[in-house]
């Protein structure tokens, strides 16, 4: 019988997708030769016994967006050949026991986005072909010993975004497959030490958007082939020495969000595939020599939106292929001149919105490559003669909102940005501050050969009248990813937000970090 | 002389929206920082936002964020809060206050007389 | 970064030396200010940077500390200082104010 029920479209005979609110139970009768189903979008509530009982070839099953509660223990009976059931984005609360029974070739569960408060391991007990096990947005509270102990298959596991609260050390301890394992988004506050152990082959780990404090010293030293570890906001106070010691393969690692006071010398390492290095939103207050030392291939280091108000003059040693340093929205009021003479490749520097009186002449020495440089919302006043008289690929460079002191030592800045205008973008261009009869006029445009002598300008001045003067125009369901690019510039947009952490919800495309790297 | 006066106070219901201008005078507009500090009735200070000489950056207390936007208009003189989502914790006098530089400092040297934000069903 | 003013008021009579203490929960260099506020009146500047007296501010007021610890003093007190002062701090976003000392008159 190879007739299409009339709720339904047949595209080929083995293919039918069952979509419309019109919909209230399972059509039928299903071409007896479908290898596909697809029931989308419809009011039903419950599932009975058998509804596919004459569709034994069935391979993939998805029965998604609908109105379900309730599931007959018999229904999926005579399923044999299934191997993808995707019952995501309904409204179960329970699975009866025995419901997966007979579904020996299943090989992906999705059961996200329901309402369950429990899984026991009877409901997974014959699926040792089983590679790929959604169980994210729902309501467990609670994994008991032994659920997964089946699955000795299983490669993905996804258990985000619920309400679990504490993990046993054991639950894991059987699935010496698994690559990628997701707790994002849960009320975890702390994971026993031992509970990854048995996961050798984990290549991701997923623990953003938790409640961690504290991480065991031995955490991952099981888990060797790990490639990405997301562990931003949680409330992680310090990092144990050596935590990412048996760590190799790293090659992405978040801690933005949590409340990392200071990173001491050889926490990070070794780890020569680490890319990236996001630590935004924590409250490291300094930086001391050789922090990141190990770090040889790192590219991007977000240090934004701390509380950094010293850097050793090594704490960059070793970072020889960073591309894009991100300090701004800090307490910075100095560096030392030699602090990113090791940065040999560096193109992005952001030092927006920190405290800087003055900068080194010889700041950016070795840094050639700079193309952008965010040095706006400083308290600069002025800045040394040549200090950017030898990046020759410098094309963005912002210097608005500094308090600049327009006398006679200006003259060297006044005349690089003459020469280099276009670098400084069209929209905001630096002023004067001081002296007050210069105030709001454009440091390039101003003459400065009339404007006062160099002198001791108070470093807040009373605030007489003046007139006036010309106004001279930073896989879905993970957030852990970033919109914007760690040299974004943020106009009108609040700088404190500057790596905006977007939330993904489909589980079934690519994880990227931003747009471009997602490929 | 420099002056700051605030406008746009007013009773709103809950989840309602206000926006409160500060018309300044007296002084360079677009080389300070400006601020909103807020009072609740008998209560201490509170800072809610800042933003910079330019408009390039801005700041906000954690309890306003996504719920207000700062704003200036430098060829108007004119600072602004947007305030949407609004909440009864978010009734208080609300001053717009003038940095004594173009960064953003939390330093004020002059302050408006004050809006009256009222916020109840 | 919470700010802890103490006393939460005092009593204190003219020509008294007064001492208003901040305490910060992390360190924040000299990034604080000391504002002073009259019923019905908008917050005064007195001192920034910790210890820098703003300009038109009577020389009696000053300020001191660095890190956690602050103080405003007021050598010698005048009726035109009895006020609610407060500490702020913008080292560290969001900026956060004290909960205010209260200097009355002695009675």
């Known amino acids: 019988y190879y007739g299409c029920p009339s709720e339904c479209t047949c595209s080929r005979a083995s293919q039918v997708e069952c979509t419309g609110a019109r919909i209230v139970a399972v059509p039928a009768p299903l071409p007896w030769n479908a290898m596909s189903l697809q029931i989308l979008n419809t009011h039903i509530t419950e599932l009975n016994e058998s509804p596919f009982l004459n569709i034994s070839a069935l391979i993939a099953l998805r029965i998604e967006k609908n109105e379900l509660s309730h599931i007959m223990p018999g229904a999926f009976r005579n399923l044999g050949s299934l191997r993808y059931l995707s019952l995501a984005n309904n409204k179960l609360q329970v699975l009866p026991i025995g419901l997966f029974q007979g579904l020996n070739n299943l090989e992906s569960l999705l059961l996200s986005s329901n309402q369950l408060v429990q899984i026991q391991p009877a409901h997974f007990s014959q699926f040792s072909n089983l590679k790929e096990l959604q169980l994210h947005g729902n309501h467990l509270e609670y994994i008991p010993d032994g659920v997964f102990d089946h699955l000795v298959g299983l490669t993905k596991l996804n258990l985000g975004k619920n309400s679990l609260t504490h993990l046993s050390p054991r639950i894991f301890q059987r699935l010496g497959n698994l690559q990628v394992l997701r707790l994002y988004e849960n009320r975890l506050s702390e994971i026993p030490m031992g509970t990854f152990d048995g996961c050798g082959n984990l290549q991701e780990l997923a623990l953003q958007q938790n409640q961690i404090g504290m991480l065991s010293p031995g955490l991952f030293h099981n888990n060797r082939n790990l490639q990405k570890l997301y562990l931003s906001n949680n409330h992680i106070s310090q990092l144990p020495p050596g935590i990412f010691m048996q760590l190799p393969q790293l090659n992405r690692l978040t801690l933005f969000g949590n409340s990392l006071k200071e990173l001491s010398p050889g926490i990070f390492g070794p780890m020569h595939n680490l890319r990236e290095l996001w630590l935004y939103d924590n409250h490291i207050t300094s930086l001391p020599d050789n922090v990141f030392s190990n770090l040889h291939q790192l590219q991007v280091l977000i240090l934004s939106r701390n509380q950094i108000n010293y850097i050793s003059p090594d704490a960059f040693n070793g970072l020889v292929e960073l591309r894009e340093l991100s300090l701004h929205t800090n307490a910075l009021q100095e560096l030392d001149g030699s602090v990113f003479r090791m940065l040999v490749n560096l193109q992005n520097i952001s030092l927006q919105n920190n405290r800087l009186r003055q900068l080194p002449g010889n700041i950016f020495a070795n840094v050639n490559g700079l193309m952008t440089i965010q040095l706006q919302n400083n308290q600069l006043e002025n800045l040394p003669m040549g200090i950017f008289d030898h990046l020759g690929n410098l094309c963005e460079l912002r210097l608005y909102d500094n308090p600049w002191r327009c006398d006679s030592d200006i003259l060297p800045l006044h005349n690089w940005l003459l020469l280099n205008k276009p670098r400084l973008g069209t929209d905001t261009l630096p002023v004067c501050f001081s002296p007050p009869s210069v105030r709001g006029q454009s440091l390039i445009i101003i003459n400065v050969n009339v404007a006062v002598p160099s002198v001791q300008v108070p470093m807040i001045p009373e605030v007489p009248s003046y007139p006036e003067t010309p106004q001279y125009p930073d896989t879905p369901s993970f957030p852990d990813t970033t919109s914007v690019s760690t040299t974004e510039f943020t106009s009108p947009v609040e700088d404190y937000t500057d790596l905006t952490t977007i939330e993904v919800t489909d589980d079934r495309s690519t994880w990227g970090m931003t747009q471009a790297q997602s490929g | 002389q420099v002056q700051l006066l605030e406008s746009g106070g007013g009773l709103v219901q809950p989840g309602g929206s206000l926006r409160l201008s500060c018309a300044a005078s007296?002084?360079?507009?677009?080389?300070?920082?400006m601020s909103w500090v807020r009072q609740a009735p008998g209560k201490g200070l509170d800072w809610v936002s800042v933003?910079?000489?330019?408009?390039?950056?801005?700041f906000y207390t954690d309890s306003v964020k996504g719920r207000f936007t700062i704003s200036r208009d430098n060829s108007e003189n004119t600072l602004y809060l947007e305030m949407n989502s609004l909440r009864a914790e978010d009734t208080a006098v609300y001053f717009c206050a003038k940095a004594v530089t173009v960064n953003t400092r939390g330093f004020f040297d002059y302050w408006g007389q004050g809006t009256l934000v009222t916020v109840s069903s | 970064i919470v700010l802890t003013q103490s006393p939460s008021s005092l009593s204190a009579s003219v020509g008294d030396r007064v001492t208003i203490t901040c305490r910060t929960s992390?360190?924040?260099?000299?990034?604080l200010g000391w504002y002073q506020q009259k019923p019905g009146k908008a917050p005064k500047l007195l001192i920034y940077?910790?210890?820098s007296l703003q300009s038109g501010v009577p020389s009696r007021f000053s300020g001191s500390g660095s890190g956690t610890d602050f103080t405003l003093t007021i050598s010698s007190l005048q009726p035109e200082d009895f006020a609610t002062y407060y500490c702020l701090q913008d080292n560290n976003y969001p900026w956060t104010f004290g909960q205010g000392t209260k200097v009355a008159i002695k009675r």
């Open positions: 933003i910079s000489g330019t408009g390039g950056s801005t």
């Open positions: 940077d910790a210890s």
């Open positions: 007296g002084f360079t507009f677009s080389t300070f920082a």
């Open positions: 992390q360190v924040i260099r000299n990034d």
